[in-house]
């Protein structure tokens, strides 16, 4: 209630002679701060004096007096919250009740804490789970109701007196709720741990033994079994007898049932520890074990492999792989049930014995078509020889052989003809299903293996075919040898290398890219006129009049081909210059006179120069010279000069006459 001081601390603390005790404690006073604190040992209230009597272990007052015992006993608290205490070392006679006498300005309180100090270190306590099963992880807990900052301890686990390999996790608690040291060990017990002793040992900081606790492990496990067989090697022949015995080496709890298994399947009516097999057959070969069950579950013995020996059975052949591709590798496997395994094999190909083949497997690294056929074998062991089985069929597949492309046409073939070709082959497995042709074209295939080329091109040089089953086999290309008229006929200037100037020596070549047959004739023409019949057309000294459009023709026995028209351009300096006058060569003063310099030039004249009768140049550079207004003094002979990139040309003199106007004559 509200009239009480509120304290929190463990109810009882445990320790032993020479150790220490640490008392975690919190409080809340009724009013104000703590002014006085006394720690009593076994306090008793004196009604006469209204005070407590008892041994004072610690005293803290306003005047600051402290008894000598205070070195051993320490108050680690404060004036309002903390009342933690430490006694180090603690003695046997400290057992009993500790009384915390607290006084504030107006209130008093006595709080009691039990202290249990034993003569020797008390043992920890091992806690086990209710049931332990083999191979199931469990946690072993070792708990000690002690912890003190001034007295370090450790807890160690032992199994049959030997420290355990597993890592333990130690934790301590020093709180107002609890004080303890705990060690937890995670452990997966095996059936062999059943009945073994586990110890938790309390040690001081130096590893010195202080106390311990022990428990015996009760590990529940399935029965552990041993199997014995007669004969000991478990190898017998058909008709022999076999005895197997099952022995239980350990079971917790006790076993309840026994059974026998062959190849994992339970044998009916076999529920005793002995299994008797009389006059065994080869079918009784297999893996035997006994199974014994308890409440935990069934336990199985190791397996005994019983081998019943017999002569080989009729054999079968397995082929890897059929059909086989020519050139690939193939493996034949002779399969025959026998015990012991066959030691010798005889192989047959199409009923005929294959010499030198005595192994279970026959490997052919490179299959050829003649390897096809039926393969069979016979197996043999110490007990006898088996029978030859039905055998297996090897199918050898290969691309079409000896493929040829055949031209059906009469030769020679001319450009534009229709050409028929056929694709032939010698043998094929599997059968030919399609044909391919090279090069590809928009050609007809009127029937399988026949190609029709309509309007054959001059450049259809060679054709090859392929016959295809799962693979394609290509024939060597066959030359069509198509004959055609000359192609790509063109005129080419051989000389000069640069532009043609008047007076140059000029050679034109009639070129063509190809012709079949190669024997050709040439023709040159200009404006429909025949000029020559050589491959070259030569001009010793070209003149402007030779300029024009030239063509050449090339023909062979198939036909003739013309070049594109080729323009021959001749460059020359301005020529045939003359000065023309407008409106005429006689003009009245004051009017306008236009002089024009006319010329023939290639390339055209770039600029003109004008001269008067004294050969003085006039400041005009265009084709026309305009005099306006013209004066009588302008009468005289004029001439012009034209310039282009080739050179210059000049005109003869042309005379302009300027006469007086009627006005001028009238003034005179």
């Amino acid at each position: 209630d509200s009239s009480k001081w509120v304290f929190e601390h463990p109810e009882t603390l445990y320790a032993w002679e020479g150790a220490c005790v640490w008392i975690p404690c919190t409080y809340r006073a009724l009013d104000g701060d703590l002014e006085s604190f006394i720690l009593f040992h076994n306090p008793e209230y004196n009604k006469n004096t209204s005070k407590f009597d008892g041994t004072r272990l610690y005293e803290s007052t306003k005047d600051g007096k402290v008894p000598s015992e205070q070195k051993r006993v320490q108050f680690l608290g404060d004036k309002n919250k903390n009342c933690t205490l430490s006694i180090h070392p603690v003695h046997l006679n400290d057992s009993g009740q500790l009384g915390l006498r607290m006084e504030s300005k107006t209130e008093k309180w006595m709080e009691r804490i039990h202290l249990n100090v034993s003569e020797r270190p008390f043992p920890p306590h091992i806690q086990l789970p209710p049931e332990i099963q083999e191979s199931q992880e469990v946690t072993l807990t070792c708990l000690l109701n002690f912890s003190c900052y001034g007295y370090p301890i450790q807890l160690q686990w032992l199994l049959e007196g030997v420290p355990m390999r597993q890592a333990a996790v130690t934790s301590t608690s020093l709180t107002i709720k609890s004080v303890f040291t705990r060690s937890e060990l995670k452990f997966s017990p095996q059936w062999s741990h059943h009945g073994k002793i586990v110890t938790c040992q309390l040690q001081d900081a130096d590893g010195k033994f202080l106390s311990n606790d022990t428990v015996q492990l009760n590990v529940k496990h399935t029965p552990k079994l041993e199997i014995k067989v007669t004969p000991s090697d478990a190898i017998v022949r058909e008709g022999d007898s076999v005895t197997m015995t099952c022995e239980v080496s350990s079971s917790n709890p006790e076993y309840t049932t026994v059974s026998w298994l062959k190849d994992g399947t339970s044998l009916k009516k076999q529920n005793t520890f002995t299994l008797n097999l009389r006059e065994v057959t080869k079918d009784q070969s297999g893996k035997y074990c006994c199974q014994v069950s308890n409440d935990v579950g069934p336990g199985r013995s190791e397996e005994v492999f019983l081998q019943v020996q017999y002569a080989p059975e009729p054999s079968t052949v397995q082929i890897l792989h059929s059909p086989a591709v020519e050139g690939s590798q193939v493996e034949f496997l002779c399969m025959s049930l026998a015990n012991p395994l066959p030691t010798n094999y005889t192989w047959y190909h199409n009923g005929k014995e294959m010499q030198g083949r005595t192994e279970e497997k026959v490997h052919i690294p490179k299959i050829l078509p003649w390897h096809a056929g039926t393969y069979s074998c016979v197996a043999e062991n110490i007990l006898g020889t088996g029978q030859r089985g039905p055998g297996a069929e090897l199918d050898v597949q290969y691309p079409p052989k000896k493929v040829t492309t055949v031209i059906q046409n009469p030769m020679p073939i001319r450009e534009g003809d229709t050409v028929t070709l056929s694709c032939n082959y010698n043998s094929s497995n599997p059968s030919v299903t399609r044909y391919e042709w090279k090069p590809h074209g928009a050609w007809e295939e009127p029937s399988l293996g026949v190609l029709k080329i309509q309007n054959v091109g001059w450049d259809n040089t060679t054709i090859a075919c392929a016959a295809c089953n799962s693979w394609c086999s290509w024939a060597s290309p066959v030359a069509l040898n198509v004959q055609y008229a000359p192609r790509d006929v063109r005129v080419r200037k051989i000389k000069p290398l640069s532009e043609i100037h008047s007076g140059n020596s000029v050679s034109l070549q009639c070129d063509f890219s190809s012709s079949h047959p190669k024997e050709v004739q040439f023709f040159w023409e200009k404006n429909g006129r025949l000029l020559g019949k050589e491959s070259q057309l030569n001009f010793d000294s070209i003149s402007p009049e030779d300029a024009g459009s030239y063509s050449c023709w090339v023909n062979n026995s198939i036909g003739q081909t013309a070049s594109k028209a080729w323009t021959l351009e001749v460059l020359y300096a301005p020529r045939r210059l003359r000065v023309s006058m407008s409106p005429g060569d006689q003009v009245m003063e004051g009017k306008s006179a236009t002089l024009t310099c006319e010329s023939d030039a290639n390339p055209p004249v770039s600029h003109y120069t004008w001269f008067d009768w004294n050969n003085q140049s006039l400041p005009y550079h265009s084709q026309k010279l305009r005099l306006e207004p013209v004066k009588v003094q302008h009468s005289g002979a004029y001439w012009c000069q034209g310039t282009n990139s080739v050179g210059k040309g000049r005109s003869p003199l042309s005379t302009l006459t300027v006469y007086y106007s009627p006005e001028t004559i009238g003034r005179r």
Partner: antibody, heavy 123, light 107 residues
Amino acid sequence: QVQLQQSGPGLVKPSQTLSLTCAISGDSVSGNRATWNWIRQSPSRGLEWLGRTYYRSAWYNDYAVSVKGRITFNPDTSKNQFSLQLNSVTPEDTAVYYCARGESGAAADAFDIWGQGTTVTVS
Amino acid sequence: DIQLTQSPPSLSASVGDRVTITCRASQSISSYLNWYQQKPGKAPKLLIYAASSLQSGVPSRFSGSGFGTDFTLTISSLQPEDFATYYCQQSYSTPQTFGQGTKVDIK
């Protein structure tokens, strides 16, 4: 070196005649290696060639179409100068007027020597 | 009449820049094309005559090229005194004509 010195009024009334003179020093107006040109410049028309006078075996004049019929060039050999007369002027004739030599030799009639320019306002 | 078209009408450049001005004639004028520089309040000054010949006294950073109808004036490394207006002019036929000008100013 060759120099051209311009003279003439800066202000002319509309419909009157504009007269400008260009005095030559270091060359002859009647030399046969030059042309003597008049050029004007205004913001609206830029540089505009008005015409030229030159002597070879006779005196020649060339006029721009824009001023033909209103313009006259007069060479004066005694004073070694040449003049421009532009009749019936309008405000459109307001411009800076330049005289320039056209070098008819290697310079291909380029204007290598210019007068200082005369600003003429028609108002 | 022969028309001359200059481009660009104006351009901004920095000292040290390479500057190119083009002039196109409406018909072939051979090599009768001249280039002038004009500064405010001054008469034009001849730089290049006959398309590519440098006028006496003009710095070698100025050069001209072209023939027929297309011509170019190049200033290889622009100097502070080169900020001005540049004109082309043909002396091939009368009337002699000028381009409209290209103004070069400081960027």
